[in-house]
């Protein structure tokens, strides 16, 4: 279905198969403001309590090409003294993204979307739900 | 250029403005597998030792167009005893995304990619680097 | 315009580190990932590893795994390659070549000037 | 690791000369990339994904192949292109580079 009434400025696209063949431009748009972008610290995967590595994944056909996988260093969490806590849980925080993936394979021009799901970063869990008081 | 030598299966596109105008099916591919699609729990927020609330993002004009943002809770983590640690921070892991902005605005067929920095869970990090022995 | 500045030559001391550093712009700087080559006195290209700036992540060839660390500074738009317990070996000329994320197909398009570090007692 | 060896290793050509660099890969590889190097200076890409010309490469470079075997060739050769040139594959870890081939003035 279109999602929204087609006006003179935009450009023409049959409305039946919509979201097979929309036009993209992929030269990205930096929203962000390179200050909010470089305060950013990417550190954390080291201070956290429940620190992380990243691995690098790379695919020539999809867009973008390179993305960096969060995995948690230890199933369990490191205390204050530095050692690993064995009734805390280091676990990987994991976000659902979606990329572009070339189809059919080598086709500079094509795209299909498809949903990719990569770890961020890890958390320390306890066992049990518990609240600050 | 054109990025690959163009093959008769591979529609045509004007190679000099490849990055601007490419075709893509927004019709979207599940690649996970719904067992680990299932598997991913939701309930981390809550037994975090950095726990965090989740609010939702809407923008019409984007694709997707629902994003749910994370925000921690607390400036400090919650300790075993489910009191606020003092000597440890809460802080948000934002990750660089990937989204389709209308352009020009409402326009249902031609999109932009612009970048977004969206927080995904939280953490708890020590000002000091620790290492588990 | 796309710059990759390195730092001057470096005379150093067997066992000894060395911190090179690359600073970028003309860029997002953000974009790109940056990757480590070498060249010896007379040799071919040897490449060291690659710090992504945006998410901190490093990759090491598995030669240079624990001699080399890569870092970036995001708020000046520099890299750095370290390289520790040197030796005779190490002497040679070191670059710095930026690799964009998003499309990976162009390859290492820019690099820096190159850094000289020699390794003697 | 992948390795490449890069034949001839040198070449003395003349101004004019049609000449071809090949690059084999020990294991199959998706893409191909070449520099350009001389004396003294960075390299310089020179042709990116095996066929495409680096923005101001002369179209008198073209490069070729798939899976282990590669080319780049010299139609004409000029003055400007005697240098020392590098083939390099990034489909497997640890990225790697060819020996080089120095092209020389005969």
């Known amino acids: 279905a279109v999602l929204i009434p087609q006006s003179s400025v935009c450009p023409n696209a049959e409305a039946n198969n919509f979201l097979q063949n929309v036009k993209v431009n992929l030269k990205v748009i930096n929203s962000l403001s390179s200050k909010a972008s470089s305060r950013r610290p990417s550190d954390y995967l080291n201070r956290s309590t429940s620190p992380w590595t990243l691995s690098r994944n790379e695919d020539p056909d999809r867009y973008p090409s390179v993305i960096w996988e969060a995995q948690c260093r230890h199933q369990r969490c490191v205390n204050a003294e530095g050692k690993l806590d064995h009734h805390m849980n280091s676990v990987l925080i994991q976000q659902e993204i979606l990329v572009l993936k070339r189809e059919p394979e080598k086709c500079p021009f094509t795209f299909r979307v498809e949903k990719m799901l990569v770890g961020v970063g890890c958390t320390c869990v306890s066992s049990i739900v518990r609240h600050a008081s | 250029a054109v990025l690959i030598p163009q093959s008769s299966v591979c529609p045509n596109a004007e190679a000099n403005n490849f990055l601007q105008n490419v075709k893509v099916n927004l019709k979207v591919i599940n690649s996970l597998s719904s067992k680990a699609s299932s598997r991913r729990p939701s309930d981390y927020l809550n037994r975090s030792t950095s726990p965090w609330t989740l609010s939702r993002n809407e923008d019409p004009d984007r694709y997707p167009s629902v994003i749910w943002e994370a925000q921690c809770r607390h400036q400090r983590c919650v300790n075993a005893e489910g009191k606020l640690d003092h000597h440890m921070n809460s802080v948000l892991i934002q990750q660089e995304i990937l989204v389709l902005k209308r352009e020009p605005e409402k326009c249902p067929f031609t999109f932009r990619v612009e970048k977004m920095l969206v927080g995904v869970g939280c953490t708890c990090v020590s000002s000091i680097v620790r290492h588990a022995s | 315009e796309v710059q990759l500045v390195q730092s001057g030559a470096e005379v150093k001391k067997p066992g000894s580190s060395v911190k090179v550093s690359c600073k970028a712009s003309?860029?997002?700087?953000?974009?790109?990932?940056i990757h480590w080559v070498r060249q010896a006195p007379g040799q071919g290209l040897e490449w060291i590893g690659v710090?992504?700036?945006?998410?901190?992540?490093?990759f090491y060839n598995q030669k240079f795994d624990g001699r080399a660390t890569l870092t970036a500074d995001k708020s000046t738009s520099t890299a750095y390659m370290e390289l520790s317990s040197l030796r005779s070996e190490d002497t040679a000329v070191y670059y710095c070549t930026r690799y964009y994320r998003y499309e990976s197909f162009y390859g290492m398009d820019y690099w820096g000037q190159g850094t000289t570090v020699t390794v003697s007692s | 690791d992948i390795q490449l060896t890069q034949s001839p290793s040198s070449l003395s050509a003349s101004v004019g000369d049609r000449v071809t660099i090949t690059c084999s890969a020990s294991s199959s590889i998706s893409y191909i990339y070449w520099f350009q190097q001389k004396p003294g200076k960075s390299p310089k890409r020179w042709i990116y994904a095996t066929f495409e010309l680096a923005s101001g490469v002369p179209s008198r470079f073209s490069g070729s192949g798939s899976g282990t075997d590669y080319t780049l060739t010299i139609s004409s050769l000029q003055p400007e292109d005697f240098a020392t040139y590098y083939c390099h594959q990034r489909s497997s870890y640890p990225w790697t580079f060819g020996q080089g081939t120095k092209l020389e003035i005969k």
């Open positions: 710090n992504d700036p945006e998410s901190g992540g490093t």
């Open positions: 003309g860029y997002t700087f953000t974009d790109y990932e």
